[in-house]
Interface confidence: low
């Protein structure tokens, strides 16, 4: 598999058949698949060197692994997008052997002297062809030469099979399956041959290809493959339940932010709630996690403005649940990214010198910002797309707080909507879905560069649109939701999470 280890060394060779039998639309589809693969790999913070070859009668090398920019995913993608099916129009045979020889030439070293560290570099060849090679001889001989060059399969004690993976995608109207199977790597419990049909569900393909065991602690990563559970898609999501004898129970959501902490809303708890009455589950697991302590933001006080006629005041409505035992990260349990951390800088592929302010400008610019929250409907977690009104619609969004029960007498809306809040909901630019009571404490998320970054904590809503746990279809335009802006509570987060190795900026 493609081992995505941020500290490892890897070369990926993209080889694309542009011969007559492929057809323009299949060529374009194959290109799109490779673009998506480059993006998927880059989302792990891994920077392999890429080689890029197209071929028909002759190969054409577009990017050499030795080039300075070959590890710049955006640049390689740009080169790939500029390739045209017509580039091989005049000589349109299928010489797969020559194409693989071009890959061999990129792998080999001048004067046959292996460079330092050559044996620690993993090589991945991704060949997209219909297998209908009709000139140049059998390409399998070049695969044998490559194995020889990389010293693979020679030493029984150290066969080094991990250092070469050949993936073959069958593209085009007709595919010679025998030829394709012959070229691909054969490894136990791994799939190295994919069909055109598979390319329609690329996330499934990447799931078969990628070994992410070295990067499970990366924040904001998800798997969207079809066989994945809700928690592959939202691995940070935590379900919180507070049992109150004789009073029933309160349900909330939260987000895993580190191996020991879940971030949620303070209003999910009362000061009387004992740790043993708080149930937290993650990863869709049945068992509840043991809780050490719930840490409230010191400025949170729901009764803080009762005297002023404001029955409930949600400013600083955030809390951290500290777990007794360390979470074991896996594909269904991993943290979400927090603002102003090194992890988020890497997730957004920003320079290491990026400041907190620059992250804020990236994630919360002064405009309508596409975001999402996760809600449970009929026992299934679903993503709901909303827009944070952070530009010209911000004022009207906040003013609609006056329609919330108990806030009708508030003279100045800033009494209840403090600078700590982000506002979503309403019908412009689109009709946003609203949060339900059980969504409280869950993350408000911005999805960028294939990663998920939490920018807010769901706090309160103007209208209860979820009578009997069913989200109503028709809701008034003033149905707004308010979320604690994490950029506004960073000092507290930084202090409480200081031992969690999140690298706050």
């Amino acid at each position: 598999k493609i081992v995505l280890d941020p500290s490892g060394s890897m070369n990926i060779y993209l080889v694309l058949d542009g011969s007559d039998s492929i057809g323009a639309s299949n060529f374009t589809g194959a290109k799109k698949c490779l673009v998506n693969l480059i993006e998927k790999v880059a989302s792990y913070g891994v920077k392999p060197r890429y080689g890029l070859v197209t071929y028909a009668t002759y190969p054409k090398i577009w990017v050499k692994v030795s080039e300075a920019d070959s590890s710049n995913a955006d640049w390689v993608t740009k080169q790939l997008n500029e390739i045209n099916y017509e580039d091989h129009k005049l000589k349109s045979g299928t010489n797969t052997k020559k194409a693989l020889q071009a890959v061999y030439s990129m792998m080999s070293w001048p004067d046959d002297v292996p460079p330092e560290g050559w044996n620690r570099t993993r090589h991945v060849i991704i060949l997209m062809t219909d297998g209908l090679h009709n000139m140049g001889g059998d390409p399998i001989t070049v695969i044998d030469e490559i194995r020889d060059l990389l010293y693979i399969g020679k030493d029984r004690k150290n066969p080094r099979e991990d250092y070469l993976d050949v993936y073959v995608f069958g593209v085009g109207p007709l595919v010679n399956q025998v030829n394709i199977n012959a070229l691909a790597s054969k490894k136990d419990n791994e799939q190295h041959v994919f069909k055109v049909k598979d390319m329609e569900n690329l996330e499934d393909v990447f799931y078969q290809m990628i070994d992410e065991s070295q990067s499970l602690s990366l924040c904001g990563m998800v798997w969207e493959h079809r066989k994945g559970t809700d928690y592959h898609k939202q691995p940070w999501q935590a379900k919180i339940s507070v049992i109150r004898p004789s009073k029933g129970h309160e349900s909330c959501m939260g987000a895993v932010v580190s191996e020991y902490f879940v971030l949620t809303a303070a209003h999910c708890f009362t000061v009387d709630d004992k740790e043993h009455s708080i149930k937290v589950s993650v990863g869709g697991e049945k068992r509840d996690l043991e809780i050490e302590v719930v840490l409230f933001h010191p400025n949170y006080n729901i009764n803080g403005k009762k005297e002023a006629g404001i029955p409930e005041f949600y400013d600083y409505d955030v809390a951290l649940i500290k777990l007794k035992n360390k979470l074991k990260y896996g594909q269904t349990i991993r943290p979400i990214c927090l603002p102003c951390t090194e992890g988020t800088t890497r997730a957004l592929r920003l320079p290491p010198t990026t400041t907190c302010q620059q992250q804020k400008e990236e994630l919360l610019p002064a405009q309508d910002i596409k975001a999402l929250f996760v809600s449970e409907e009929e026992k299934k977690l679903t993503r709901k797309e909303v827009y944070i009104k952070n530009g010209d619609k911000k004022g009207s969004c906040e003013r609609d707080a006056q329609y919330a029960p108990g806030y009708d007498k508030v003279k100045d809306i800033s009494e209840v909507v403090t600078p700590r809040f982000l506002c979503t909901g309403g019908v412009s630019p689109y009709a946003d879905p609203n949060t339900c009571r059980g969504d409280s404490g869950g993350p408000l998320i911005v999805h960028k560069r294939s990663r998920f970054i939490q920018v807010g904590v769901i706090s309160w809503g103007v209208v209860d649109v979820c009578k009997n746990q069913k989200r109503q279809k028709q809701v008034p335009a003033h149905a707004r939701d308010f979320h604690i802006n994490l950029f506004q509570v960073l000092p507290w987060l930084k202090e409480k999470l200081q031992d969690e190795d999140l690298g706050f900026l």
Partner: antibody
Framework: EVQLVESGGGLVKPGGSLRLSCAAS????????MSWVRQAPGKGLEWVAT????????YYPDSVKGRFTISRDNAKNSLYLQMSSLRSEDTALYYC????????WGQGTSVTVSS | DIQMTQSPSTLSASVGDRVTITCRAS??????VAWYQQKPGQPPKLLIY???TRHTGVPDRFSGSGSGTDFTLTISSLQAEDFATYYC?????????FGQGTKLEIK
Amino acid sequence: EVQLVESGGGLVKPGGSLRLSCAASGFTFSNYAMSWVRQAPGKGLEWVATISNRGSYTYYPDSVKGRFTISRDNAKNSLYLQMSSLRSEDTALYYCARERPMDYWGQGTSVTVSS
Amino acid sequence: DIQMTQSPSTLSASVGDRVTITCRASQDVGTAVAWYQQKPGQPPKLLIYWASTRHTGVPDRFSGSGSGTDFTLTISSLQAEDFATYYCHQHSSNPLTFGQGTKLEIK
């Protein structure tokens, strides 16, 4: 605007031959695979042949294999279907269509095989 | 060969109705399914390809869904000009095949 115009249809006796043509315009013809699809009177659609964009590869269903030949002349923006050993069941309206799936179709040319 | 079975063969509906036509493939075709509309005396017109992608210029009342073996074409609110015959088509593998057609007529 993509345009496909078929011609060459007509009445032919069983066992006879006919050559259909399709003139293409409004797009880069050499970039696209092309197909022939037929429709018998009052019936559904049946795929007849496909040719790759540069003409090196051709595909047929068993019902016409060995009797029909699809070809193209990219310099002339033209697609052809040479039909021989015609049978009464080949009677249909023959459409030429672009790419796969077929995104643009001509108006069709009628072929009648009858004695 | 992959058989494409459409149902129903005939469908009577009124303007404004929501109608659904289904198509079942005899084996897995991924999402390589297209839908065509054909009116008498005219060639077929591509509506949907790759199961759910609307072709250029096709009104958004037409939508497609499905993958594997079961596919659906939905017209959310029938207009007078939508009465026609509809065909599904698999473009996954040779031989390319079509459904037998669904005739949508005025009730």
